[in-house]
């Protein structure tokens, strides 16, 4: 049995998330559980640092993209939202909050602005933005 979740504020189209096919969770109340990850979209504009603090206060982190397969629902995300990816000028890499380096071919990084933070947009794109710019954000919690 599938339950349709209508998240018009976050997704480009109706997203169906299986509720009984396999157990997923636990997740905080009202968060989306999908393939062993919990997600929540926050429709309030904060800069990257404030967004990070907000996620941390809920025992979560900003969105981390680690698998196109496990996170295929992210293909449908609309608009732009802070994720947990930051630029490390000293070695030229893009790094997640947990210190891991962005894997090649996982995201297309696009220079939209001078900046050291990145916004997530549909189809696995990361838009470089000034970390001080207010944007909506996505928090994520791993369940396993």
């Amino acid at each position: 049995i599938w339950s349709a979740v209508f998240l018009n504020s976050l997704f480009n189209q109706e997203v169906q998330i299986p509720l009984t096919e396999s157990y997923c969770g636990p997740c905080p109340k009202n968060w989306i559980c999908y393939k062993n990850n919990c997600y929540q979209f926050f429709d309030e504009s904060k800069n990257w640092y404030e967004s990070q603090a907000s996620c941390m206060s809920q025992n979560a982190s900003l969105l981390k993209v680690y698998s196109k397969e496990d996170q295929d629902l992210l293909k449908l995300v609309k608009s732009y939202h802070w994720m947990g990816l930051v630029h490390i000028p000293t070695n030229g890499s893009w790094q997640w909050e947990d210190g891991s380096i962005l894997s090649p071919n996982l995201l297309t990084i696009i220079e939209m602005q001078k900046g050291d933070c990145a916004l997530y947009a549909s189809s696995f794109k990361g838009y470089i933005e000034n970390c001080s710019t207010p944007n909506t954000y996505i928090c994520m919690q791993r369940t396993v």
Epitope: G92, W94, D116
Partner: antibody, heavy 119, light 106 residues
């Protein structure tokens, strides 16, 4: 491999406008910003501005009123237009790209095009 | 605008000597970048983010500094190092370059 190549008129009369084209290969203008930098003969480097992947621009405020940067993504070309040229606009004009996504330094430069302002 | 002042303007050294050139910023910056330019050529990326050597740059080059004071050092100068070296910052708009230090080999 990443390459940038400038082409310009060479000689421009005072008070006239300048148009230079930067043709790029080895990367897409929909992913990277392209910068313009100039260097008067025997002098240092001056940053003119940048056009980002999405088409937004930043300019050096000292030249902003005379400067316009645009691009054609499908032709992989970036355009610099400068109005009201004076003798001291005589310079080598370079286009450049960052060393990688988000770099605040220039890893790739064109060979430059010489612009002489003279009547 | 952040002004970058390079010193000395001209530096003369003999092969094998250690040389240091400095770049001072009018306000604090997070990182400094350096380029090498030889006559008739485009600038080449040389050191980025204060201390990282660009691809192909010999290990005798190093960069250091923080705040408003940065430097480029060559441990043992060679004839091929003769060039003008420019520092660059982009802590804030506009991006600015120093006026350059010309390294001459005796």
């Amino acid at each position: 491999q990443v390459q940038l190549q400038e082409s310009g008129p060479g000689l421009v009369a005072p008070s006239q406008s300048l148009s230079i084209t930067c043709t790029v290969s080895g990367f897409s203008l929909t992913s990277y910003g392209v910068h313009w930098i100039r260097q008067p003969p025997g002098k240092g480097l001056e940053w003119l501005g940048v056009i980002w992947a999405g088409g937004s621009t930043n300019y050096n405020s000292a030249l902003m009123s005379r400067l316009s940067i645009s691009k054609d993504n499908s032709k992989s070309q970036v355009f610099l237009k400068m109005n009201s040229l004076q003798i001291d606009d005589t310079a080598m004009y370079y286009c450049a790209r960052g060393g990688y996504e988000g770099a605040a330094w220039f890893g790739y430069w064109g060979q430059g095009t010489t612009v002489t302002v003279s009547s | 605008d952040i002004q970058l002042t390079q010193s000395p303007a001209i530096l003369s050294a003999s092969p094998g000597e250690k040389v240091t050139m400095t770049c001072r910023a009018s306000s604090s910056v997070s990182y400094m970048h350096w380029y090498q330019q030889k006559p008739g050529s485009s600038p080449k990326p040389w050191i980025y983010a204060t201390s990282n050597l660009a691809s192909g740059v010999p290990a005798r080059f190093s960069g250091s500094g923080s705040g408003t004071s940065y430097s480029l050092t060559i441990s043992r100068v060679e004839a091929e190092d003769a060039a003008t070296y420019y520092c660059q910052q982009w802590n804030s708009n506009p991006l600015t370059f120093g006026a350059g230090t010309k390294l001459e080999i005796k």
